[in-house]
C-alpha cells in the first residue's frame, strides 16, 4: 500500500518565494509522520522537513540552508520556501512517511513540481554563499 501524492506540475517564484502544496491520498489527522521536500531529479537535496505529531506542535526545519516553513492540512502539507535563488530553479518532489500508528506507509514517487525562480536576483553575500549548483 502506497500513498499517492499530487503536486502542481510547475510553479513560478516571482518574488523568490513559493508555496508548494503536497496533497496526499491519506488523512494525516492523529498520525505521526515525516513530510519532506526534495530537490533534483535524483531527490539528492532534502530541502525541508515537517514532522507531525498528534500531541505536539509541527516541527519544521531545513538542514540544507533553505528558508522554509510548513503548514498542515488533513490531507496535505504546504511548504513555503523563501529567499530562493535563480539557480535553485529545479524539480522538487514531495515525500511522506507515516510512522505511527503502524503500519509504516510511504508514497509512490510523484511527478514533481518544477519551481522556476524568477524576478529579483538575490545575490548571496560573499560571507554566506548560496547553495551551489549540483
Amino acid at each position: 500500500n502506497k500513498i499517492l501524492v499530487k503536486q502542481s506540475p510547475m510553479l513560478v517564484a516571482y518574488d523568490n518565494a513559493v508555496n508548494l502544496s503536497c496533497k496526499y491520498s491519506y488523512n494525516l489527522f492523529s498520525r505521526e509522520f515525516r513530510a519532506s521536500l526534495h530537490k533534483g531529479l535524483d531527490s539528492a537535496v532534502e530541502v525541508c522537513v515537517v514532522y507531525g505529531n498528534y500531541s505536539q506542535q509541527l516541527q519544521v526545519y531545513s538542514k540544507t540552508g533553505f528558508n522554509c516553513d510548513g503548514k498542515l492540512g488533513n490531507e496535505s502539507v504546504t511548504f513555503y520556501l523563501q529567499n530562493l535563488y535563480v539557480n535553485q530553479t529545479d524539480i522538487y518532489f514531495c515525500k511522506i512517511e507515516v510512522m505511527y500508528p503502524p503500519p509504516y506507509l510511504d508514497n509512490e514517487k510523484s511527478n514533481g513540481t518544477i519551481i522556476h525562480v524568477k524576478g529579483k536576483h538575490l545575490c548571496p553575500s560573499p560571507l554566506f554563499p548560496g547553495p551551489s549548483k549540483p
Epitope: 505521526e32 515525516r34 498528534y54 512517511e97 510512522m99 505511527y100 500508528p101 503502524p102 503500519p103 509504516y104 510511504d106
Partner: antibody
C-alpha cells in the same frame, strides 16, 4: 537466517560518548518492510526504547534521549550504529538492537546485547 | 507517553499451573481493529523473545500453551500449563504511539 550482532560496549567515562554497532544478516537494512530499533536495559530494570531507523534512512527517537542520540547506518556493511553523547551513570545498561516489521512494529529478532558501563 | 502497567509484578507458580499476566495501558492502543500490544519473554542474561504480537497472534515457533487476548486498554498473557522453561520475566510493549513503551515486567518464579 536473520541475525543481529551488537558490538562496541565497554567502560566509558561520564561525559563521554559511545558508538555501538549492530551488524545485520539475513535481511537488508534498506529493504522496505522492516526497520531496526535500539532498546536498552539498565541492570535489574525494565526495557527502554531508544529509537529506530526505517528502510528509507529516516529516524525516530525517544524524546527523553533525542538531544543526545543519533542512529545511523552503513548500507554497504548492512550495519546500524547508535551514538550516545554526554553519558552519565544512568546510561549504564545492556544495549540491544532489534528488528521490527512494518505491519505491527513488533520486535521479532533481537541481538544478544552489549553492556555499556558509565563510570569513572 | 502511553504507560503500561503489568500485574502482578511477580508471581510464584508450579509446573502445570495456569498463569495469567495482565497489562493495562493508560490509553487505547487499538487502531482500525488492531491492538498494537506485544508480549516478550526474557530469561536472565538473554535478549527478550517475541511471544505474541498484535495482542493475540502467536509468533512462529512459540508453543501453543502461550496465548494473548484483550483490546483497547486491557490485555492478558496466559500460559495454559506452565513448563520448567517458562520461568522468566514477561514484558508487554505498545507500538501504537511513539515513544514505544514497555511494561515494568512480571517475574514468574518457581513455587
Amino acid at each position: 537466517e536473520v541475525q543481529l550482532v551488537e558490538s562496541g560496549g565497554g567502560l566509558v567515562q561520564p561525559g563521554g560518548s559511545l558508538r555501538l554497532s549492530c551488524a545485520a544478516s539475513g535481511f537488508s537494512l534498506s529493504t522496505s518492510g522492516v526497520g531496526v530499533g535500539w532498546i536498552r536495559q539498565a541492570p535489574g530494570k525494565g526495557l527502554e526504547w531508544i529509537g529506530e531507523i526505517y528502510h528509507s534512512g529516516s529516524t525516530y527517537y525517544n524524546p527523553s534521549l533525542k538531544s543526545r542520540v543519533t542512529i545511523s547506518r552503513d548500507n554497504s556493511k548492512n550495519t546500524l550504529y547508535l551514538q550516545l553523547n554526554s553519558l552519565r551513570a544512568e546510561d549504564t545498561a545492556v544495549y540491544y538492537c532489534a528488528r521490527y516489521k512494518y505491519d505491527y512494529y513488533d520486535f521479532d529478532y533481537w541481538g544478544q546485547g552489549t553492556l555499556v558501563t558509565v563510570s569513572s | 507517553d502511553i504507560q503500561l502497567t503489568q500485574s502482578p509484578s511477580s508471581l510464584s507458580a508450579s509446573v502445570g499451573d495456569r498463569v495469567t499476566i495482565t497489562c493495562r495501558a493508560s490509553q487505547s492502543v487499538d487502531f482500525h481493529g488492531i491492538s498494537f500490544l506485544h508480549w516478550y519473554q526474557q530469561k536472565p542474561g538473554k535478549a527478550p523473545k517475541l511471544l505474541i504480537y498484535a495482542a493475540s497472534s502467536l509468533q512462529s515457533g512459540v508453543p501453543s500453551r502461550f496465548s494473548g487476548s484483550g483490546s483497547g486498554t486491557d490485555f492478558t498473557l496466559t500460559i495454559s500449563s506452565l513448563q520448567p522453561e517458562d520461568f522468566a520475566t514477561y514484558y508487554c510493549q505498545q507500538s501504537y504511539r511513539s515513544p514505544r513503551t514497555f511494561g515494568q515486567g512480571t517475574k514468574v518464579e518457581i513455587k
